[in-house]
Protein backbone atom coordinates (compact mmCIF):
# COMPACT_ATOMS: atom_id res chain seq x y z
CA UNK A 1 0.00 0.00 0.00
CA UNK A 2 1.05 3.01 -0.24
CA UNK A 3 2.32 4.95 2.29
CA UNK A 4 2.58 9.08 3.23
CA UNK A 5 2.22 11.77 6.00
CA UNK A 6 -0.18 14.78 5.16
CA UNK A 7 2.01 17.06 2.54
CA UNK A 8 2.07 20.91 3.84
CA UNK A 9 3.93 23.63 1.96
CA UNK A 10 4.25 26.66 2.99
CA UNK A 11 3.10 29.80 0.76
CA UNK A 12 5.26 32.66 -0.38
CA UNK A 13 8.66 30.59 -0.69
CA UNK A 14 11.43 32.37 -2.60
CA UNK A 15 13.37 28.83 -3.25
CA UNK A 16 13.48 27.47 -6.85
CA UNK A 17 12.27 24.14 -5.34
CA UNK A 18 10.98 23.63 -1.86
CA UNK A 19 10.82 19.56 -0.70
CA UNK A 20 6.98 19.31 -0.03
CA UNK A 21 7.38 15.38 0.87
CA UNK A 22 7.91 11.68 -0.59
CA UNK A 23 5.19 9.16 -2.29
CA UNK A 24 6.15 5.59 -1.13
CA UNK A 25 4.98 2.41 -1.78
CA UNK A 26 5.56 -0.05 0.61
CA UNK A 27 6.37 -2.40 -2.00
CA UNK A 28 9.53 -0.14 -3.24
CA UNK A 29 12.50 -2.65 -2.35
CA UNK A 30 14.78 1.07 -3.25
CA UNK A 31 16.52 -1.12 -6.36
CA UNK A 32 14.97 1.64 -8.50
CA UNK A 33 12.94 -0.62 -10.15
CA UNK A 34 9.37 1.64 -9.53
CA UNK A 35 8.92 4.72 -11.34
CA UNK A 36 6.55 7.49 -9.68
CA UNK A 37 4.46 9.89 -11.22
CA UNK A 38 2.29 12.92 -10.56
CA UNK A 39 -1.08 14.03 -11.94
CA UNK A 40 -4.08 16.34 -11.81
CA UNK A 41 -3.77 19.93 -11.83
CA UNK A 42 -0.56 21.54 -10.66
CA UNK A 43 1.23 18.25 -11.35
CA UNK A 44 4.31 19.35 -13.89
CA UNK A 45 4.08 22.79 -13.35
CA UNK A 46 3.46 23.42 -9.35
CA UNK A 47 5.08 20.21 -8.19
CA UNK A 48 7.36 17.71 -9.50
CA UNK A 49 8.28 14.11 -8.43
CA UNK A 50 11.53 12.82 -8.62
CA UNK A 51 10.53 9.72 -10.42
CA UNK A 52 12.76 7.22 -8.83
CA UNK A 53 12.38 8.33 -4.91
CA UNK A 54 8.91 9.60 -5.13
CA UNK A 55 10.47 13.14 -3.81
CA UNK A 56 7.64 15.80 -4.13
CA UNK A 57 8.73 19.42 -4.96
CA UNK A 58 6.80 23.03 -5.27
CA UNK A 59 8.66 24.98 -7.99
CA UNK A 60 6.63 27.37 -7.80
CA UNK A 61 6.03 30.16 -5.41
CA UNK A 62 2.39 29.74 -3.58
CA UNK A 63 -0.31 32.28 -2.22
CA UNK A 64 -2.92 30.15 0.05
CA UNK A 65 -4.87 32.68 -0.33
CA UNK A 66 -5.17 32.20 -4.42
CA UNK A 67 -5.33 28.30 -3.73
CA UNK A 68 -4.81 26.52 -0.63
CA UNK A 69 -5.00 23.20 -1.24
CA UNK A 70 -4.01 20.88 -4.67
CA UNK A 71 -5.87 17.88 -5.21
CA UNK A 72 -3.32 15.15 -6.85
CA UNK A 73 -3.21 11.50 -8.00
CA UNK A 74 -0.22 9.03 -7.17
CA UNK A 75 0.90 6.48 -9.76
CA UNK A 76 3.57 3.33 -9.40
CA UNK A 77 4.89 1.68 -12.00
CA UNK A 78 6.81 -1.15 -11.88
CA UNK A 79 9.32 -0.61 -14.90
CA UNK A 80 10.52 -3.90 -15.36
CA UNK A 81 6.73 -5.18 -16.52
CA UNK A 82 5.21 -1.96 -17.05
CA UNK A 83 2.70 -2.52 -14.75
CA UNK A 84 0.65 -0.15 -11.71
CA UNK A 85 2.50 -1.34 -8.57
CA UNK A 86 -0.53 0.18 -6.52
CA UNK A 87 -3.95 1.48 -7.47
CA UNK A 88 -3.93 5.37 -8.67
CA UNK A 89 -4.52 7.40 -5.29
CA UNK A 90 -5.74 10.73 -4.38
CA UNK A 91 -3.80 12.91 -1.95
CA UNK A 92 -3.92 16.32 -0.58
CA UNK A 93 -1.46 19.04 -0.63
CA UNK A 94 -2.23 22.32 1.78
CA UNK A 95 -0.58 25.41 1.51
CA UNK A 96 0.09 26.07 4.95
CA UNK A 97 -0.49 29.74 5.71
CA UNK A 98 1.78 32.88 6.94
CA UNK A 99 0.60 36.32 8.11
CA UNK A 100 1.04 37.77 4.55
CA UNK A 101 -2.62 40.13 4.15
CA UNK A 102 -2.99 42.70 6.53
CA UNK A 103 -6.70 43.86 7.23
CA UNK A 104 -8.83 45.76 5.39
CA UNK A 105 -12.29 47.50 5.81
CA UNK A 106 -14.58 46.55 2.77
CA UNK A 107 -17.30 48.56 3.65
CA UNK A 108 -15.43 52.07 3.37
CA UNK A 109 -16.72 54.65 3.22
CA UNK A 110 -18.49 54.84 6.66
CA UNK A 111 -20.26 57.32 8.38
CA UNK A 112 -22.98 57.66 11.14
CA UNK A 113 -24.80 60.50 12.20
CA UNK A 114 -25.94 60.48 16.04
CA UNK A 115 -27.57 62.90 18.36
CA UNK A 116 -25.67 65.81 20.05
CA UNK A 117 -25.13 65.39 23.69
CA UNK A 118 -25.71 61.67 23.69
CA UNK A 119 -24.47 60.03 26.79
CA UNK A 120 -21.01 58.39 27.41
CA UNK A 121 -21.43 54.77 26.09
CA UNK A 122 -24.33 55.75 23.19
CA UNK A 123 -23.24 53.25 19.99
CA UNK A 124 -22.60 55.02 17.27
CA UNK A 125 -21.32 52.42 14.31
CA UNK A 126 -19.44 49.19 13.94
CA UNK A 127 -16.66 48.60 11.59
CA UNK A 128 -15.29 45.32 10.56
CA UNK A 129 -12.24 44.52 9.07
CA UNK A 130 -11.58 41.48 7.08
CA UNK A 131 -8.33 39.46 6.48
CA UNK A 132 -7.40 37.08 4.38
CA UNK A 133 -5.37 35.10 6.27
CA UNK A 134 -6.60 31.62 7.55
CA UNK A 135 -8.30 32.29 10.29
CA UNK A 136 -7.77 28.92 11.68
CA UNK A 137 -4.17 29.24 11.52
CA UNK A 138 -2.51 30.58 14.40
CA UNK A 139 -3.60 34.78 14.93
CA UNK A 140 -2.70 35.78 11.37
CA UNK A 141 -6.34 36.96 10.96
CA UNK A 142 -7.49 37.82 14.19
CA UNK A 143 -7.95 41.20 14.65
CA UNK A 144 -7.86 44.14 17.33
CA UNK A 145 -9.05 47.29 16.87
CA UNK A 146 -7.76 50.50 17.65
CA UNK A 147 -8.78 54.25 17.86
CA UNK A 148 -5.71 56.48 16.12
CA UNK A 149 -8.07 59.81 15.82
CA UNK A 150 -11.04 60.65 18.01
CA UNK A 151 -10.13 60.41 21.40
CA UNK A 152 -11.53 62.12 24.17
CA UNK A 153 -14.76 61.89 22.19
CA UNK A 154 -15.03 58.27 21.00
CA UNK A 155 -13.85 54.84 21.86
CA UNK A 156 -13.49 51.24 19.89
CA UNK A 157 -14.41 48.14 21.63
CA UNK A 158 -11.13 45.72 20.52
CA UNK A 159 -12.59 42.51 19.53
CA UNK A 160 -16.00 43.73 17.74
CA UNK A 161 -15.01 47.25 16.05
CA UNK A 162 -18.27 49.15 17.72
CA UNK A 163 -17.60 52.41 18.01
CA UNK A 164 -19.29 54.71 21.35
CA UNK A 165 -19.23 58.02 22.41
CA UNK A 166 -16.76 58.68 25.06
CA UNK A 167 -17.63 62.23 26.21
CA UNK A 168 -20.45 64.49 25.22
CA UNK A 169 -20.41 66.71 22.20
CA UNK A 170 -21.93 69.63 21.20
CA UNK A 171 -23.27 70.51 17.88
CA UNK A 172 -22.72 73.94 17.63
CA UNK A 173 -18.75 73.83 18.98
CA UNK A 174 -18.29 71.22 16.34
CA UNK A 175 -20.43 69.09 13.80
CA UNK A 176 -18.66 66.66 12.71
CA UNK A 177 -15.28 64.18 13.30
CA UNK A 178 -12.95 62.20 11.94
CA UNK A 179 -12.30 59.04 13.69
CA UNK A 180 -9.52 56.57 12.31
CA UNK A 181 -9.47 52.98 13.58
CA UNK A 182 -7.19 50.59 12.99
CA UNK A 183 -7.10 47.04 12.68
CA UNK A 184 -4.18 44.79 13.31
CA UNK A 185 -3.94 41.25 13.06
CA UNK A 186 -1.59 38.70 15.03
CA UNK A 187 -3.94 40.24 17.95
CA UNK A 188 -1.72 42.84 18.20
CA UNK A 189 1.40 41.03 18.73
CA UNK A 190 5.02 41.92 17.27
CA UNK A 191 5.16 40.98 13.62
CA UNK A 192 1.03 42.50 13.49
CA UNK A 193 -0.29 43.98 9.58
CA UNK A 194 -2.76 46.70 10.20
CA UNK A 195 -5.30 48.59 7.46
CA UNK A 196 -6.81 51.92 8.64
CA UNK A 197 -10.32 53.82 8.28
CA UNK A 198 -11.80 56.71 8.63
CA UNK A 199 -14.83 57.26 9.66
CA UNK A 200 -17.23 60.69 9.48
CA UNK A 201 -19.39 60.74 12.34
CA UNK A 202 -21.80 63.88 11.74
CA UNK A 203 -23.91 65.40 14.95
CA UNK A 204 -27.23 65.67 14.54
CA UNK A 205 -29.28 68.67 16.22
CA UNK A 206 -31.04 68.45 19.12
CA UNK A 207 -32.93 71.34 20.93
CA UNK A 208 -30.69 72.23 23.42
CA UNK A 209 -30.28 76.09 22.65
CA UNK A 210 -33.28 78.92 23.04
CA UNK A 211 -33.62 81.69 21.08
CA UNK A 212 -31.76 84.57 22.93
CA UNK A 213 -32.27 88.42 21.27
CA UNK A 214 -29.27 89.91 19.21
CA UNK A 215 -29.99 93.33 21.48
CA UNK A 216 -31.50 94.12 24.63
CA UNK A 217 -33.03 97.45 23.42
CA UNK A 218 -34.92 97.95 20.01
CA UNK A 219 -35.75 101.46 18.90
CA UNK A 220 -38.85 102.06 16.57
CA UNK A 221 -41.12 104.96 15.54
CA UNK A 222 -44.99 104.84 14.85
CA UNK A 223 -46.56 107.96 13.33
CA UNK A 224 -49.93 108.87 15.40
CA UNK A 225 -51.63 108.77 11.85
CA UNK A 226 -50.93 104.88 11.64
CA UNK A 227 -53.59 102.71 11.31
CA UNK A 228 -54.14 99.76 12.98
CA UNK A 229 -52.46 96.74 11.55
CA UNK A 230 -49.34 98.72 10.73
CA UNK A 231 -45.99 97.32 10.86
CA UNK A 232 -43.85 99.29 13.11
CA UNK A 233 -40.83 97.78 13.11
CA UNK A 234 -38.96 94.01 13.08
CA UNK A 235 -37.23 92.37 16.21
CA UNK A 236 -34.88 89.54 15.83
CA UNK A 237 -33.12 86.75 18.31
CA UNK A 238 -30.85 83.92 17.01
CA UNK A 239 -30.69 80.35 18.03
CA UNK A 240 -27.26 78.02 18.17
CA UNK A 241 -29.27 75.07 17.02
CA UNK A 242 -30.94 74.26 13.44
CA UNK A 243 -33.55 73.37 11.43
CA UNK A 244 -37.03 72.79 13.15
CA UNK A 245 -35.14 73.48 16.74
CA UNK A 246 -34.36 77.13 15.39
CA UNK A 247 -38.03 77.79 14.82
CA UNK A 248 -39.46 80.70 17.52
CA UNK A 249 -42.08 82.29 18.66
CA UNK A 250 -41.88 86.16 19.09
CA UNK A 251 -44.49 87.28 21.57
CA UNK A 252 -45.63 90.09 23.91
CA UNK A 253 -44.36 89.77 27.44
CA UNK A 254 -45.33 93.52 29.09
CA UNK A 255 -47.49 96.47 27.79
CA UNK A 256 -49.80 97.80 29.64
CA UNK A 257 -51.15 99.84 27.29
CA UNK A 258 -51.66 97.20 25.48
CA UNK A 259 -51.11 99.15 22.18
CA UNK A 260 -49.04 96.94 20.42
CA UNK A 261 -48.72 93.25 19.33
CA UNK A 262 -45.91 90.87 17.58
CA UNK A 263 -46.41 88.47 14.88
CA UNK A 264 -43.72 85.69 14.15
CA UNK A 265 -41.99 85.85 10.61
CA UNK A 266 -41.80 81.89 9.93
CA UNK A 267 -39.61 82.57 6.84
CA UNK A 268 -37.03 85.08 8.25
CA UNK A 269 -37.96 84.15 12.03
CA UNK A 270 -38.34 87.93 12.80
CA UNK A 271 -40.57 89.41 15.14
CA UNK A 272 -42.87 92.12 13.59
CA UNK A 273 -43.78 94.57 15.55
CA UNK A 274 -47.46 96.15 14.78
CA UNK A 275 -49.62 98.64 16.34
CA UNK A 276 -53.34 97.41 18.28
CA UNK A 277 -54.77 100.95 18.92
CA UNK A 278 -53.58 103.78 17.37
CA UNK A 279 -51.68 106.17 18.95
CA UNK A 280 -51.99 109.87 19.94
CA UNK A 281 -48.99 111.74 20.30
CA UNK A 282 -50.50 114.59 22.35
CA UNK A 283 -51.81 111.69 25.00
CA UNK A 284 -48.61 109.66 25.20
CA UNK A 285 -45.86 110.27 22.68
CA UNK A 286 -43.44 106.98 23.52
CA UNK A 287 -44.43 103.51 24.56
CA UNK A 288 -41.81 100.35 26.61
CA UNK A 289 -42.36 97.08 25.82
CA UNK A 290 -40.97 93.93 26.84
CA UNK A 291 -41.09 91.05 24.14
CA UNK A 292 -40.10 87.65 24.57
CA UNK A 293 -39.31 84.88 22.16
CA UNK A 294 -39.40 81.46 22.34
CA UNK A 295 -38.68 77.79 20.45
CA UNK A 296 -41.57 76.97 18.49
CA UNK A 297 -40.57 73.01 18.99
CA UNK A 298 -39.11 72.06 22.52
CA UNK A 299 -39.18 68.67 23.12
CA UNK A 300 -40.30 67.31 27.47
CA UNK A 301 -36.77 66.04 27.76
CA UNK A 302 -34.86 68.89 27.16
CA UNK A 303 -37.15 71.83 28.95
CA UNK A 304 -34.27 72.13 31.34
CA UNK A 305 -32.60 74.52 28.46
CA UNK A 306 -35.51 76.51 28.18
CA UNK A 307 -36.56 77.53 31.20
CA UNK A 308 -35.91 81.56 31.57
CA UNK A 309 -37.13 82.92 27.87
CA UNK A 310 -34.44 85.73 26.47
CA UNK A 311 -36.83 89.02 26.53
CA UNK A 312 -36.27 92.60 25.22
CA UNK A 313 -37.06 95.82 25.31
CA UNK A 314 -38.64 98.03 22.90
CA UNK A 315 -38.73 101.78 23.14
CA UNK A 316 -41.53 103.04 20.36
CA UNK A 317 -41.20 106.77 20.13
CA UNK A 318 -44.67 108.51 18.49
CA UNK A 319 -44.18 110.94 16.15
CA UNK A 320 -46.08 114.06 16.02
CA UNK A 321 -48.27 114.97 12.84
CA UNK A 322 -49.54 118.09 12.64
CA UNK A 323 -53.43 118.54 12.79
CA UNK A 324 -55.36 120.46 10.80
CA UNK B 1 -17.41 106.78 34.47
CA UNK B 2 -19.67 109.28 33.22
CA UNK B 3 -19.46 112.26 32.76
CA UNK B 4 -21.30 115.08 31.37
CA UNK B 5 -19.69 118.64 31.49
CA UNK B 6 -21.84 121.88 29.91
CA UNK B 7 -20.18 124.57 28.77
CA UNK B 8 -21.38 127.86 26.71
CA UNK B 9 -23.42 129.89 29.61
CA UNK B 10 -23.41 133.58 29.66
CA UNK B 11 -25.13 136.61 30.00
CA UNK B 12 -26.68 137.83 26.37
CA UNK B 13 -29.50 140.66 26.00
CA UNK B 14 -32.96 139.88 25.05
CA UNK B 15 -33.51 138.61 21.59
CA UNK B 16 -29.61 137.31 21.07
CA UNK B 17 -28.44 133.97 21.45
CA UNK B 18 -26.53 131.51 22.66
CA UNK B 19 -25.08 127.92 21.74
CA UNK B 20 -24.85 125.60 24.65
CA UNK B 21 -22.22 122.43 24.62
CA UNK B 22 -22.32 118.98 26.88
CA UNK B 23 -19.47 117.01 26.14
CA UNK B 24 -19.81 113.29 27.05
CA UNK B 25 -17.50 110.95 28.35
CA UNK B 26 -17.04 107.54 30.08
CA UNK B 27 -19.93 106.00 27.68
CA UNK B 28 -21.16 105.15 24.20
CA UNK B 29 -22.66 108.52 23.46
CA UNK B 30 -24.28 107.03 20.04
CA UNK B 31 -26.29 104.75 21.91
CA UNK B 32 -28.16 107.10 23.88
CA UNK B 33 -31.05 109.62 23.98
CA UNK B 34 -29.74 113.23 25.26
CA UNK B 35 -31.93 115.97 26.92
CA UNK B 36 -31.69 119.48 28.20
CA UNK B 37 -33.41 120.35 31.39
CA UNK B 38 -33.10 124.09 33.14
CA UNK B 39 -33.83 125.47 36.53
CA UNK B 40 -34.61 128.82 36.79
CA UNK B 41 -33.54 130.38 40.07
CA UNK B 42 -35.17 129.42 43.26
CA UNK B 43 -37.39 127.61 41.19
CA UNK B 44 -37.73 123.39 40.02
CA UNK B 45 -37.15 121.48 36.88
CA UNK B 46 -38.35 122.06 33.50
CA UNK B 47 -37.67 119.61 30.82
CA UNK B 48 -36.83 121.77 27.24
CA UNK B 49 -35.77 119.34 24.73
CA UNK B 50 -35.04 115.60 23.95
CA UNK B 51 -33.18 114.33 21.04
CA UNK B 52 -32.85 110.36 19.83
CA UNK B 53 -29.57 108.24 19.67
CA UNK B 54 -29.25 108.72 16.22
CA UNK B 55 -29.91 112.41 16.01
CA UNK B 56 -33.04 111.62 13.53
CA UNK B 57 -35.59 112.93 16.24
CA UNK B 58 -35.73 115.96 18.38
CA UNK B 59 -38.97 116.56 20.71
CA UNK B 60 -39.24 120.44 22.25
CA UNK B 61 -41.22 121.97 25.34
CA UNK B 62 -43.43 124.13 24.12
CA UNK B 63 -42.22 127.32 26.06
CA UNK B 64 -39.02 126.64 23.44
CA UNK B 65 -40.59 125.54 19.83
CA UNK B 66 -39.27 127.31 17.40
CA UNK B 67 -36.81 129.26 19.26
CA UNK B 68 -34.56 126.38 20.72
CA UNK B 69 -32.51 123.52 18.32
CA UNK B 70 -31.16 120.59 19.72
CA UNK B 71 -28.38 118.93 18.19
CA UNK B 72 -25.55 116.45 18.59
CA UNK B 73 -22.16 115.89 17.13
CA UNK B 74 -21.10 112.05 17.30
CA UNK B 75 -17.63 112.17 16.16
CA UNK B 76 -17.28 114.57 18.81
CA UNK B 77 -18.86 113.35 21.86
CA UNK B 78 -20.85 116.47 22.52
CA UNK B 79 -24.77 117.88 22.80
CA UNK B 80 -25.77 121.11 21.57
CA UNK B 81 -28.32 123.53 22.71
CA UNK B 82 -29.09 126.62 20.37
CA UNK B 83 -31.04 129.16 21.81
CA UNK B 84 -32.17 132.12 19.92
CA UNK B 85 -35.07 134.96 20.60
CA UNK B 86 -33.85 134.64 23.78
CA UNK B 87 -36.32 136.41 26.61
CA UNK B 88 -36.17 136.84 29.81
CA UNK B 89 -37.92 133.35 31.52
CA UNK B 90 -35.21 131.68 29.64
CA UNK B 91 -32.64 132.57 32.29
CA UNK B 92 -31.94 129.50 34.20
CA UNK B 93 -28.76 126.94 34.47
CA UNK B 94 -29.33 124.83 31.96
CA UNK B 95 -28.07 120.95 32.55
CA UNK B 96 -27.60 117.92 30.21
CA UNK B 97 -28.74 114.70 31.09
CA UNK B 98 -28.56 111.19 29.47
CA UNK B 99 -31.75 109.44 29.33
CA UNK B 100 -31.41 105.38 30.77
CA UNK B 101 -31.07 103.02 28.42
CA UNK B 102 -33.96 100.50 29.48
CA UNK B 103 -36.86 103.68 30.23
CA UNK B 104 -36.95 107.44 30.17
CA UNK B 105 -35.94 108.53 33.46
CA UNK B 106 -32.40 110.74 33.88
CA UNK B 107 -29.39 108.53 34.96
CA UNK B 108 -26.69 110.94 34.56
CA UNK B 109 -26.69 114.60 34.71
CA UNK B 110 -23.90 117.10 34.13
CA UNK B 111 -23.38 120.16 36.18
CA UNK B 112 -24.87 122.55 34.93
CA UNK B 113 -24.55 126.13 32.60
CA UNK B 114 -25.82 129.24 34.06
CA UNK B 115 -27.77 131.58 31.13
CA UNK B 116 -28.72 135.10 31.93
CA UNK B 117 -31.10 137.15 29.50
CA UNK B 118 -31.29 140.70 30.89
CA UNK B 119 -30.58 143.78 29.12
CA UNK C 1 -49.58 116.88 29.47
CA UNK C 2 -49.42 115.50 33.03
CA UNK C 3 -49.46 117.92 35.74
CA UNK C 4 -47.41 116.31 39.12
CA UNK C 5 -48.35 118.09 42.61
CA UNK C 6 -46.05 116.98 45.24
CA UNK C 7 -46.76 117.53 48.97
CA UNK C 8 -45.73 119.15 51.38
CA UNK C 9 -44.31 121.42 50.01
CA UNK C 10 -41.34 121.77 52.64
CA UNK C 11 -40.94 118.84 55.29
CA UNK C 12 -39.34 119.22 58.66
CA UNK C 13 -37.94 116.39 60.37
CA UNK C 14 -34.95 115.35 62.33
CA UNK C 15 -32.02 112.74 61.54
CA UNK C 16 -33.56 109.04 62.15
CA UNK C 17 -37.03 110.03 61.13
CA UNK C 18 -39.13 108.79 58.49
CA UNK C 19 -39.83 111.03 55.49
CA UNK C 20 -42.90 110.11 53.16
CA UNK C 21 -43.38 112.34 50.25
CA UNK C 22 -46.18 112.56 47.96
CA UNK C 23 -46.69 113.53 44.17
CA UNK C 24 -50.30 113.19 42.77
CA UNK C 25 -50.56 112.88 38.58
CA UNK C 26 -53.35 115.07 36.89
CA UNK C 27 -54.30 111.81 35.23
CA UNK C 28 -52.85 108.23 35.28
CA UNK C 29 -48.73 107.73 34.59
CA UNK C 30 -49.34 104.09 32.30
CA UNK C 31 -46.71 101.56 33.18
CA UNK C 32 -45.42 103.45 36.33
CA UNK C 33 -43.05 105.76 34.49
CA UNK C 34 -42.17 107.61 37.12
CA UNK C 35 -39.09 109.00 39.01
CA UNK C 36 -37.93 110.84 41.94
CA UNK C 37 -34.54 112.85 42.28
CA UNK C 38 -32.61 114.32 44.80
CA UNK C 39 -30.87 117.44 44.31
CA UNK C 40 -28.70 119.25 47.17
CA UNK C 41 -27.95 122.98 47.30
CA UNK C 42 -25.54 123.62 44.39
CA UNK C 43 -25.77 120.28 42.84
CA UNK C 44 -27.28 118.71 39.82
CA UNK C 45 -30.29 116.36 40.92
CA UNK C 46 -29.21 112.94 41.24
CA UNK C 47 -31.73 110.02 40.08
CA UNK C 48 -32.98 108.26 42.72
CA UNK C 49 -36.27 105.70 41.80
CA UNK C 50 -37.48 104.74 38.14
CA UNK C 51 -40.09 102.91 37.24
CA UNK C 52 -41.75 103.93 40.59
CA UNK C 53 -40.03 101.44 42.60
CA UNK C 54 -36.95 100.83 41.23
CA UNK C 55 -33.64 101.88 43.16
CA UNK C 56 -30.71 103.69 40.87
CA UNK C 57 -27.85 102.52 41.00
CA UNK C 58 -25.56 103.40 43.92
CA UNK C 59 -29.01 104.11 45.93
CA UNK C 60 -28.94 103.50 49.68
CA UNK C 61 -31.99 100.84 50.55
CA UNK C 62 -33.89 103.61 52.84
CA UNK C 63 -34.96 105.42 49.67
CA UNK C 64 -38.38 103.43 48.37
CA UNK C 65 -40.82 104.19 45.84
CA UNK C 66 -44.57 103.51 45.32
CA UNK C 67 -47.33 103.94 44.02
CA UNK C 68 -49.37 103.46 40.53
CA UNK C 69 -51.80 105.03 38.18
CA UNK C 70 -52.13 109.11 39.64
CA UNK C 71 -50.29 108.68 43.62
CA UNK C 72 -47.12 107.96 44.27
CA UNK C 73 -45.34 107.89 47.06
CA UNK C 74 -41.30 108.60 47.96
CA UNK C 75 -40.54 107.18 51.56
CA UNK C 76 -37.04 107.67 53.29
CA UNK C 77 -36.76 105.52 55.77
CA UNK C 78 -34.38 107.04 58.74
CA UNK C 79 -32.71 110.54 57.19
CA UNK C 80 -29.46 110.88 57.10
CA UNK C 81 -27.86 114.44 57.89
CA UNK C 82 -26.89 113.87 53.62
CA UNK C 83 -30.91 113.14 52.56
CA UNK C 84 -31.77 116.67 53.71
CA UNK C 85 -32.46 118.44 50.51
CA UNK C 86 -34.89 118.95 47.58
CA UNK C 87 -36.64 115.79 45.97
CA UNK C 88 -38.49 115.95 42.79
CA UNK C 89 -41.18 113.65 41.19
CA UNK C 90 -40.98 113.17 37.29
CA UNK C 91 -43.30 111.51 34.91
CA UNK C 92 -42.14 110.24 31.67
CA UNK C 93 -45.61 108.43 30.01
CA UNK C 94 -45.95 111.75 28.35
CA UNK C 95 -42.97 113.79 27.25
CA UNK C 96 -41.40 114.86 30.51
CA UNK C 97 -43.08 116.44 33.48
CA UNK C 98 -41.65 117.05 36.91
CA UNK C 99 -43.32 118.27 40.37
CA UNK C 100 -42.54 121.65 41.93
CA UNK C 101 -40.14 119.54 44.12
CA UNK C 102 -40.86 119.20 47.70
CA UNK C 103 -37.91 120.26 50.44
CA UNK C 104 -36.70 117.98 53.22
CA UNK C 105 -35.21 120.56 55.88
CA UNK C 106 -33.64 119.91 59.42
CA UNK C 107 -36.44 120.42 61.88
Known amino acids: GWVWNQFFVPEEMNTTSHHVGRLRSDLDNGNNSFQYKLLGAGAGSTFIIDERTGDIYAIEKLDREERSLYILRAQVIDITTGRAVEPESEFVIKVSDINDNEPKFLDEPYEAIVPEMSPEGTLVIQVTASDADDPSSGNNARLLYSLLQGQPYFSVEPTTGVIRISSKMDRELQDEYWVIIQAKDMIGQPGALSGTTSVLIKLSDVNDNKPIFKESLYRLTVSESAPTGTSIGTIMAYDNDIGENAEMDYSIEEDDSQTFDIITNHETQEGIVILKKKVNFEHQNHYGIRAKVKNHHVDEQLMKYHTEASTTFIKIQVEDVDEP | QVQLVESGGGVVQPGGSLRLSCAASGFTFSSYDMHWVRQAPGKGLEWVAV????????YYADSVKGRFTISRDTSKNTLYLQMNSLRAEDTAVYYCARERYFDWSFDYWGQGTLVSVSS | EIVLTQSPGTLSLSPGERATLSCRAS???????LAWYQQRPGQAPRLLIYGASSRATGIPDRFSGSGSGTDFTLTISSLEPEDFAVYYCQQYSNSWTFGQGTKVEIK
Open chain 2, 51 to 58: ISYDGTNE
Open chain 3, 27 to 33: QSVSNTY
